[in-house]
């Protein structure tokens, strides 16, 4: 289809080396309800669309996504080609940084119901560069945590550095919605609660004498519990004595609960003790079997082929730690009787 | 008893100003509410017209129409809600009521029994 | 700010009718959505949050629902105390949950 009659937004990707980080592009279509596709102004880069196209209007969201080659070539599909780029809905995005993300991305709806439709289209042109030399060393993250039941504020990454003062108006958006009431480089949240969890993404315009682009930038924002004050527990085994069948195959699950911790580095292993040795055993992968806000459950086996007497007179000791402490469960073993 | 009273309504002239106040009484300020004012003229609707954050933000936040002019404020040791009004118009003639949300029924649980301003010469 | 357009904005109707207000946004809330019951000379008395929930005390004649945009409040079986104004209310404003702008309201009169 041709592509000249689309209309075009500039944006620019500036990403921090140091991170991972996402991004975004929105299909900035026209609401359908309030016009029939295209039949209304464009935006100027000043006027914020009143919220996101086809948002909530189940016939139209789905959109087409294609990306326009550098030399010339037909429009490519997204889909097809590019497998860092994941589409959702009307949103396009990009899972990994790198300047090999610049490009002319054009979106138009799927349905086209009139002939009006051919041309409604969005292009949009995006460059993307590595930030250089960290102009600001203390940049707001791209991921970022709210502490649930306290204040918190979500910074825009690309503006953090400047106070509120100097701030150029910016467009912030979460989950894709437009947040239209929220119009500085910071978002203060009252009281955090579950639901301020989410992606959120800021833009604002940056202009030179010959044009003017969308800065724009993707915050992770996550809701988290205060870090635990408590040293993980062991919820299993809870018995220091096994009973056991001589020459059988034996497996010991240790189950521990860590506390949430923001750093989270949770240690558990198995060691013998055999009277005065002690020894680190080769066991399989821990691995977590319940995770929630609050806590997280861990599970590592121990593994023997076949119990032997001399297994008998050792103890097994599982070990668990994290940032506050540890806790240790014995388990010796018993021969079964009868 | 958990109730609100506003005072502070009288009739003032055009141009004029006028600060509003609304006790709390049988809560605490502290408990992180939103506290805000909602107005309604003679025989019309209700209006929206400031809340602000009682917890350590502070936050506030106005309808469009009344930024620049009202101001929202509290005195977190009286338990008390503010209204500053000013370069008050005949249009502002309501009655203004103080209305707690409610934390976990999310709207105003919680109203007093209004104040009534008439801006008139 | 965001616009609330309640619709009819009056209604006559019988004890026992089924009645339904219409409320729209002008953008999606969510379910960020409450209803309030006001009588002459009172103050409002709210009646529904977060689009569906009934508030606490309020009879099971009265549902919400919606989400969105779109919302409405039904009275399942009119009764003599219900002939009262009712608004709508966004219950959010950014990403923070505070009540604010309101629907003009719907006069509910006696046939």
């Known amino acids: 289809f041709n592509i000249s009659g689309c209309s075009t937004k500039k944006l620019l990707w500036t990403y921090s080396t140091r991170s991972e980080e996402e991004f975004v592009l929105f299909c900035d279509l026209p609401e359908p309800q309030k016009s029939h596709f295209c039949h209304r102004n464009r935006l100027s880069p000043k006027q914020v669309p009143e919220h996101l196209p086809f948002m909530g209007s189940n016939d139209l969201s789905d959109v087409q996504w294609y990306q326009q080659p550098s030399n010339g070539d037909p429009l490519e599909d997204i889909r097809k080609s590019y497998p860092h780029i994941i589409q959702d809905k009307c949103t396009l995005h990009f899972l990994t940084p790198g300047v090999n993300n610049s490009g002319s991305y054009i979106c138009r709806p799927k349905m086209i119901k009139s002939p009006y439709d051919v041309a409604c289209c969005v292009k949009m042109i995006l460059e993307v560069k590595p930030q250089t030399n960290a102009s600001c060393e203390y940049s707001a993250s791209h991921k970022q945590d709210l502490l649930l039941g306290s204040t918190g504020s979500i910074s825009c990454p690309s503006l953090s550095c400047q106070s509120d003062a100097q701030s150029p108006a910016v467009t912030w958006y979460k989950n894709g919605k437009l947040l239209s009431v929220e119009r500085s480089n910071r978002i203060v949240v009252d009281e955090v609660y579950d639901y301020h969890q989410g992606t959120y993404v800021c833009d604002y315009t940056q202009s030179d004498t010959v044009s003017s682009w969308t800065v724009r930038a993707v915050v992770q924002v996550r809701t988290i519990v205060g870090d635990t004050k408590l040293k993980p527990d062991i919820l299993d085994p809870v018995e220091d004595t096994l009973e056991v069948e001589l020459g059988k195959p034996l497996t010991i699950s240790c189950k521990a609960r860590f506390g949430f911790e923001r750093v989270f580095n949770p240690v558990i292993k198995w060691y013998i003790k055999d009277s005065d040795l002690e020894w680190e055993v080769s066991v399989p992968e821990a691995k977590s079997i319940k995770s929630t806000l609050k806590d997280e459950i861990i599970e590592r086996n121990i593994i023997l082929e076949k119990v032997t007497q001399r297994d008998l007179r050792r103890k097994f000791v599982c070990f668990v730690q994290n940032s506050i402490g540890n806790t240790t469960q014995s388990v010796q073993l018993k021969e079964k009787r009868g | 008893e958990v109730q609100l009273e506003e005072s502070g309504g009288g009739l003032v002239q055009p141009g004029g100003s006028l600060r509003l106040s609304c006790a709390a009484s049988?809560?605490?300020?502290?408990?992180?509410?939103?506290m805000c004012w909602v107005r309604q003229a003679p025989g019309k609707g209700l209006e929206w017209v400031a809340c602000?954050?009682?917890?350590?933000?502070?936050?506030?936040y106005y309808a469009n129409w009344a930024k620049g002019r009202f101001t929202i404020s509290k005195d977190l040791s009286k338990t008390t809600l503010y209204l500053q009004m000013n370069s008050l118009r005949a249009e502002d003639t309501a009655t203004y009521f103080c209305?707690?949300?409610?934390?976990?029924?999310?709207?105003?649980?919680?109203w007093g029994q209004g104040t009534l301003v008439t801006v008139s010469s | 700010d965001i616009q609330m357009t309640q619709s009819p904005s009056s209604l006559s109707a019988s004890v026992g009718d089924r009645v339904t207000i219409t409320c729209q946004a002008s953008?999606?809330?969510?379910?960020?959505l409450a209803w309030y019951q006001q009588k002459p000379g009172q103050a409002p008395k709210l009646l529904i949050y977060?689009?569906?929930n009934l508030a606490s005390g309020v009879p099971s004649r009265f549902s919400g629902s919606g989400s969105g945009t779109d919302f409405t409040l039904t009275i399942s079986s009119l009764q003599p105390e219900d002939f009262a104004t009712y608004y709508c209310?966004?219950?959010?404003?950014?990403?923070?949950?505070?009540?604010?702008?309101f629907g003009q309201g719907t006069k509910v009169v006696i046939k």
């Open positions: 209305a707690r949300d409610d934390k976990v029924e999310h709207g105003y649980g919680l």
């Open positions: 049988g809560f605490s300020f502290n408990n992180n509410y939103y």
């Open positions: 602000i954050y009682t917890g350590s933000t502070g936050s506030t």
């Open positions: 953008e999606s809330i969510d379910n960020w």
């Open positions: 977060s689009a569906s």
């Open positions: 209310q966004s219950t959010f404003y950014g990403v923070n949950p505070v009540p604010n702008a």
